[in-house]
Interface confidence: medium
Amino acid sequence: AAIIPQSSACPNTEAKDFLQNVKVNLKVFNSLGAKVSSRRPSDYLNRSTSPWTLHRNEDPDRYPSVIWEAQCRHQRCVNAEGKLDHHMNSVLIQQEILVLKREPESCPFTFRVEKMLVGVGCTCVASIVRQAA
Amino acid sequence: AAIIPQSSACPNTEAKDFLQNVKVNLKVFNSLGAKVSSRRPSDYLNRSTSPWTLHRNEDPDRYPSVIWEAQCRHQRCVNAEGKLDHHMNSVLIQQEILVLKREPESCPFTFRVEKMLVGVGCTCVASIVRQAA
């Protein structure tokens, strides 16, 4: 990804100023209303054939300050008998997310936007068997 | 929801002003560098026992403008023989993400931050059997 100077459709907006002076209105937040905020944590992490644990990633200078990162519990998947199936692998599903990071010692508060790659949960896939040539 | 400083080291920062006048520096973007942007889409969506499809959600007035939303292909999971297993359910793993939406006709450019709930992939869970009382 790259950010490079250019002219702007807004008159008198210099690229160098623009980059550091984008205003963000943080008042309006949920595009899906209560559907987002009220949702309960799911129990899929325990019930899945590729169960996972959630690890707390906390940074008080970031929004969201707490991000829960998934890690698969096993390398293999759990079969109907509760045993590990050596033909099936638990793999991490990852998602790229945006976060706001507070610039150190900035007054007034200034944030930068960052991308993070986070594990969201695990799924079960058939092992790929490599055939000898 | 709003982002409000918990204890403000900056004097005279009123929350009401703060919310609408947060500056965001767009110069620094990838916290993980090339690890994020260059990563290839995974083939897990086809190889999973709970396969999914990706649907394109496109909005040129949003960043990211293209978001891929997962939907489980089947209500059940696929077993080793490639048949649907009626004791196992495919369920959607969802993640809350932040997006930037451009405020209409704003000069200089002003953005609002929104939360979206997106499907990231699917996992396979044992069906919950409800016992009769």
Partner: nanobody
Framework: EVQLVESGGGLVQPGGSLRLSCAAS????????MYWVRQAPGKGLEWVAS????????YYVDSVKGRFTISRDNAKKSLFLQMNSLRAEDTAVYYC????????????WGQGTLVTVSS
């Protein structure tokens, strides 16, 4: 998957002309501002030109104004850069890039096409 494929680069003498093309796929081409950017040997990325979604407005870096013309064909999902009166300092790899609402930010650009201006 978003794809941008540039073509049309090559070796040209000072004062000569080239026309670069970019074929886009994987997104709604007509909904996005598009850009040409370049990277000279040993230098950083430099924005060259941009064009609005409907082609109504174009913007150029000062050093190419009057010499380069950006255009687009939304029906064919194509972006073009007509380069006239080329100079040695225009030597660079030229990339086509898809714009985002963040006007200075690119998530996607092509593999680039090399333009060499030399006698």
């Amino acid at each position: 998957e978003v794809q941008l494929v540039e073509s049309g680069g090559g070796l040209v003498q000072p004062g000569g002309s080239l026309r670069l093309s970019c074929a886009a796929s994987g997104f709604t081409f007509s909904s996005y501002r598009m850009y040409w950017v370049r990277q000279a040997p040993g230098k950083g990325l430099e924005w060259v030109a941009s064009i609005e979604q409907d082609g109504s407005e174009e913007y150029y870096v000062d050093s190419v104004k009057g010499r380069f013309t950006i255009s687009r064909d939304n029906a064919k999902k194509s972006l073009f850069l007509q380069m006239n009166s080329l100079r040695a300092e225009d030597t660079a790899v030229y990339y086509c890039a898809k714009g985002e609402i963040l006007p200075l930010y690119f998530d996607y650009w092509g593999q680039g096409t090399l333009v060499t201006v030399s006698s």
